[in-house]
C-alpha cells in the first residue's frame, strides 16, 4: 500500500483551510479522549479511479468520498483519519486531514474527497473514514467503513495500468485446446514478442470435484524473434484414469517485467457428455 506520488496533497476547499498529513493510524484522541466529539461521516462512497504519476505511469487508485451530517457537531470536527486496510495481508495505510480553520454551516452539505491511495489489481480493501477527534471509549462510533474490491487485469481499464502491463496483461495467448486420441491434448497459443520461456501446467480433475487427480508441467523454451506472435503447438499426455476427465490448462509466461510472477492464462476442457442410456426393459417378467 502506498500513496500516489508524494507531491503536496490538498484537502482545502472554499471556507476551509485543510492540510493532509501522514498518519500512524493511531490518532492522539485515542490516547487523550475529548468530551465533545463529532458525529460519523455520511454516505461514504469508494470508487475505482485511475491516476498518472509524475513519471507518466498509470495506477488504479481508491477514490474516497463522503459528506458531513448537518448537525451541530461539525463545530467540534477537527479533521478526519482515512484508513485503507488490504484484507489478504492486513497491511494498513492512513492519512489525516487536519482542519486549520473551524467549519461553519453553509448553504450546501460539506463534501470531502481523496484519491491518492494506490490499490493493486484483484485485491480487496476495507476503507474507513474516522472523524476526529475519535469518540470516548463508550461513545457512539464516529467512523464509517466500506469494503472495496479492485478488478483483476482482465478488466478493460485495469489492463492498461502500469502494474497490469508489467505482469503481461497486454498478451492475449488465445489458447485453444483439442482432445486427441490416445489420451492426449493438443494445446495451441500465440507467443508474445519477447524471447522468454513459458510453462504449461496441465491439471486434471474428476467430473464434479475440485481436488486434482493428475498434474503435469511442460516447459517451452524461449522462441526466436522470427517466432514472435506465431502459434506454438504442444501435445500433452494425459493420465489414463477413469473419471479424471476435466482438464485445466494454464500458460505462464516469464516476461522480463514480471519474471516468476506473470499473469497466467487458462482454458478448461470439460468431461465428455454421458449419453442418457435408458434403463433396459426385461423381455420377460419373472413370476416369483
Amino acid at each position: 500500500l502506498r500513496l500516489l506520488d508524494h507531491r503536496a496533497l490538498v484537502c482545502s476547499q472554499p471556507g476551509l483551510n485543510c492540510t493532509v498529513k501522514n498518519s500512524t493510524c493511531l490518532d492522539d484522541s485515542w490516547i487523550h479522549p475529548r468530551n465533545l466529539t463529532p458525529s460519523s461521516p455520511k454516505d461514504l462512497q469508494i470508487q475505482l479511479h485511475f491516476a498518472h504519476t509524475q513519471q507518466g505511469d498509470l495506477f488504479p487508485v481508491a477514490h474516497i468520498e463522503w459528506t458531513l451530517q448537518t448537525d451541530a457537531s461539525i463545530l467540534y470536527l477537527e479533521g478526519a483519519e482515512l484508513s485503507v486496510l488490504q484484507l489478504n495481508t492486513n497491511e494498513r495505510l492512513c492519512v489525516r486531514f487536519e482542519f486549520l480553520s473551524k467549519l461553519r454551516h453553509h448553504h450546501r452539505r460539506w463534501r470531502f474527497t481523496f484519491s491518492h491511495f494506490v490499490v493493486d489489481p484483484d485485491q480487496e480493501y476495507e476503507v474507513t473514514v474516522h472523524h476526529l477527534p475519535k469518540p470516548i471509549p463508550d461513545g457512539d462510533p464516529n467512523h464509517q467503513s466500506k469494503n472495496f474490491l479492485v478488478p483483476d487485469c482482465e478488466h478493460a481499464r485495469m489492463k492498461v495500468t502500469t502494474p497490469c502491463m508489467s505482469s503481461g496483461s497486454l498478451w492475449d495467448p488465445n489458447i485453444t485446446v483439442e482432445t486427441l486420441e490416445a489420451h492426449q491434448l493438443r494445446v495451441s497459443f500465440t507467443l508474445w514478442n519477447e524471447s522468454t520461456h513459458y510453462q504449461i501446467l496441465l491439471t486434471s480433475f474428476p467430473h464434479m470435484e475440485n481436488h486434482s487427480c493428475f498434474e503435469h508441467m511442460h516447459h517451452i523454451p524461449a522462441p526466436r524473434p522470427e517466432e514472435f506472435h506465431q502459434r506454438s503447438n504442444v501435445t500433452l499426455t494425459l493420465r489414463n484414469l477413469k473419471g479424471c476427465c476435466r482438464h485445466q490448462v494454464q500458460i505462464q509466461p516469464f516476461f522480463s517485467s514480471c519474471l516468476n510472477d506473470c499473469l497466467r492464462h487458462s482454458a478448461t476442457v470439460s468431461c465428455p457428455e454421458m449419453p442418457d442410456t435408458p434403463e433396459p426393459i426385461p423381455d420377460y417378467m419373472p413370476l416369483w
Epitope: L201, H211, S212, F214, E215, H216, M217, R239, Q252, D261
Partner: nanobody, 115 residues
Amino acid sequence: EVQLVESGGGLVQAGGSLRLSCVASVSTFSLYSMAWYRQGPGNQREFVATISSDDGDIIQYADSVKGRFTISRDNVKRTVYLQMNSLKPEDTAVYYCNRPRDNYWGKGTLVTVSS
C-alpha cells in the same frame, strides 16, 4: 503456508556428481507436479527439469542437462530429487525447487563446479 527446503548443494570437481533434495511441508505432496530451476551468476532463472504428480511418470529436461541429470520423487518422504552426474563448470548456479501450480519456491541450494 507451504515450505520447500532444498539441500545437497556444495563444491564439486568437473565430472563429479551431486544429489539435490527438496522436501515439501505438505501431506498432499503427491498431487502436485514439481520442478527444478537454476540461476547462474548474472543470469536469469532457467528451467532444469520437471516431474508429474503421483508416480512421476512424465518427465521433461532442459536440453543442456539431458542425459546427465535425473529427476525423481518419493511421495512418502515428500521429496523431489535431482541427481546430477558429469557436472560441468557451466552448471554452477543456485538450484531452486518449485511447485508450479501455485508458484511456491524454495530458498535454493548453491552448486559450484570447479574446473
